[in-house]
């Protein structure tokens, strides 16, 4: 699942340290016991530089062979490389391995530009910075692929999140995340707080530079700030979600909802971009382009290619909008919205440019598969996966990128009727589900 | 069709204040189309971008210029321009306005532009 | 920064020849890359933007090619009035700031 503006993503560290996070209001939700509080051990256990992807390390096979492994709730294969490969520091060697289990079969996963291919089998995996527990779960061993991994990314394989329904090469593939609920007490949930750079990172910084958390099991109060709003899981296959408003600025976009989620809106912390369907995109832009007019930019900076700089220091956040999208609600006829700042869809860009200057990439870009709720979005919210409640939390990420006159929000509730009309009924075919790079 | 014209002293002190004007005619400085630029040449040397200003006033510098450099505009007169301050012998030129369009990034239109010597 | 490199720094040629021009960027510009011509005592004028697209009024003989890092412009057939330098400017980072340092086209 990994493409164009797909894979790579970004990460970096800013915002306060952990003595620093803003006290969280109470919370008005109930939880189930044992689903919340401290996981510190998980705390910042994810890293990544610029635009390359957010990565956990992990453990594989016996004697235990250490992996770094990009997070990616937009696909649902773990999948590590298995063999020499140019960008490649290491890689998984299955002959060394005495509980590798091979399942005698192959996968190949193509891409709008790329692809992966390899053998499917079984060994002991762990994640060292996560909970005590080792399950034996499927492992894609890739042993050819073309334009997957990255140069420097410093990456050498990706956990698949999502559910079995987009696994490869069918839904019997166990994803690793049922295996480790199935084999353990964790609880089945998992929480995302990945910390953008927010200014160009020089390359000791963005090597140095840590990214984020991935809390297994649960949720850490420490990572967000307020409460948290769920929306629900519209259907297990991606983290599926239904949009039912646009805002840029506060200005209403006016399109039919249906178009915000044509032909689905994901969560997906894989993709770097705020991606959205060809018609919001031109309307979104239109809108952002009105709203920051003061000050033109290139057409190819629209298009998310050409860089714009400023002297370091000087980037006005003030005059670009933000950025909301009202989610459905868990109650009937009502919804909450996640609101973002330039700070999160202006991406810096590290090493372009002299010292003297900070430049950015647009971060919110064209989609021929509907919305995808990339890093751009997940960037400035702690995201909680509770598939336990087959729902998505969001709140206020205590390490989001900010400026002192705006911040990122969640807040609710709305009246927002007929939400169900929303979403986007894709024509059930053979080959539904079967492009699975995002263009 | 438009054509752009640059002012000014052809001898400047130095430390003193290089001051250049551009006059557009037959089209308007207020176009959205366009960005307005300033690009100096130092004799047998190569093009050094200075800055650009966007009519609304918006303005971006040479980051190595930029404590120097003072682009403003006028649109009533149809004219932006160009004030560099603390000049040395260093900043003798051929200084050359020009229109930054094809989506505000390149060069398509420029003036004849007018030397500038810096000397007591 | 990037840095624009353009080589020869000097390319002698009779008219009719065939000029084929180079500019390397340190790092990609992607196709945002730009070609002027400039004769002496003139204000530069732009010929190619976007790598390969001819500026309004351009000759067919003037052609650019290449993307990221490598960039050539050709001119098919050289006229007497070709004779002139040529400087690529990259605009991948914008403002538009950098151009290189310029080939010389001169009559052999």
């Known amino acids: 699942t990994h493409l164009g503006i797909r894979l790579p993503l970004r990460s970096g560290l800013a915002g306060p340290p952990l003595g620093l996070r803003l006290p969280r209001e109470t919370d008005e939700e109930s939880e189930e016991p044992g689903r919340r509080g401290s996981f510190v051990e998980m705390v910042d256990n994810l890293r990544g530089k610029s635009g390359q992807g957010y990565y956990v390390e992990m453990t594989v096979g016996s004697p235990p062979q250490t992996l770094n492994i990009l997070v990616d709730t937009g696909s649902s294969n773990f999948a590590v490389g298995a063999a020499p490969h140019p960008f490649l520091h290491r890689y998984y060697q299955r002959q060394l391995s005495s509980t590798y289990r091979d399942l005698r079969k192959g996968v190949y996963v193509p891409y709008t530009q790329g692809k992966w291919e390899g053998e499917l089998g079984t060994d002991l995996v762990s994640i060292p910075h996560g909970p005590n527990v080792t399950v034996r779960a499927n492992i894609a061993a890739i042993t050819e692929s073309d334009k997957f991994f990255i140069n420097g990314s410093n990456w050498e394989g990706i956990l698949g999140l999502a559910y079995a329904e987009i696994a490869r090469p069918d839904d019997s593939l166990e994803p690793f995340f049922d295996s480790l609920v199935k084999q353990t007490h964790i609880p089945n949930i998992f929480s995302l707080q990945l910390c953008g750079a927010g200014f160009p990172l020089n390359q000791t910084e963005a090597l140095a530079s840590v990214g984020g958390s991935m809390i297994i099991g649960g949720i850490d109060h420490s990572l967000y700030t307020g409460r948290l709003w769920y929306t629900p899981i519209r259907r297990e296959w991606y983290y599926e979600v239904i949009i039912v408003r646009v805002e840029i600025n506060g200005q209403d976009l006016k399109m039919d909802c249906k178009e915000y989620n044509y032909d689905k809106s994901i969560v997906d912390s894989g993709t770097t971009n705020l991606r959205l369907p060809k018609k919001v995109f031109e309307a979104a832009v239109k809108s952002i382009k009105a709203a920051s007019s003061t000050e033109k930019f290139p057409d190819g900076f629209w298009l998310g290619e050409q860089l714009v700089c400023w002297q370091a220091g000087t980037t006005p956040w003030n005059i670009f909008p933000v950025i909301s999208l009202y989610l459905m609600g868990e109650v009937t006829n009502q919804s909450f919205r996640i609101t973002i700042l330039p700070q999160q869809y202006l991406r810096p860009v590290e090493d372009v440019a002299t010292s003297q200057d900070d430049c950015y990439k647009f971060a919110v870009s064209q989609s021929s598969t509907g919305t995808v709720m990339g890093a751009v979005i997940m960037e400035g919210f702690y995201v909680v996966f509770d598939r336990a409640r087959k729902r998505i939390g969001f709140a206020v990420s205590a390490c989001h990128v900010h400026d002192e006159f705006r911040t990122a929000a969640v807040e609710g509730p709305f009246v927002t009727a007929d939400m169900e009309d929303c979403g986007y009924n894709i024509p059930q075919t053979d080959e539904s589900t079967l492009m699975t790079g995002r263009a | 069709q438009l054509q752009l014209q640059e002012s000014g002293p052809g001898l400047v002190k130095p430390s003193e204040t290089l001051s250049l004007t551009c006059t557009v005619s037959g089209g308007s400085i207020s176009s959205s189309s366009y960005y307005w630029g300033w690009i100096r040449q130092p004799p047998g040397k190569g093009l050094e971008w200075i800055g650009n200003?966007?009519?609304?006033?918006?303005?971006y510098y040479n980051p190595s210029l930029k404590s120097r450099v003072t682009i403003s505009v006028d649109t009533s007169k149809n004219q932006f321009s160009l004030k560099l301050s603390s000049v040395t012998a260093a900043d003798t030129a051929v200084y050359y306005c020009?229109?930054?369009?094809?989506?505000?990034?390149?060069?398509?239109?420029w003036g004849r532009g007018t030397l500038v010597t810096v000397s007591s | 920064e990037i840095v624009l490199t353009q080589s020869p720094a000097t390319l002698s040629l009779s008219p009719g020849e065939r000029a084929t021009l180079s500019c390397r960027a340190s790092q990609s510009v992607s196709s945002y890359l730009a070609w002027y011509q400039q004769k002496p005592g003139q204000a530069p004028r732009l010929l190619i933007y976007d790598a390969s697209n001819r500026a309004t009024g351009i000759p067919a003989r003037f052609s650019g090619s290449g993307s990221g890092t490598d960039f050539t412009l050709t001119i098919s057939s050289l006229e007497p009035e070709d004779f002139a330098v040529y400087y690529c400017?990259?605009?991948?980072?914008?403002?538009?700031?950098?151009f290189g340092g310029g080939t010389k086209v001169e009559i052999k």
């Open positions: 020009a229109r930054l369009g094809h989506g505000y990034s390149y060069f398509d239109l």
């Open positions: 400017q990259q605009v991948y980072l914008w403002p538009p700031r950098t």
């Open positions: 200003i966007y009519y609304s006033g918006s303005t």
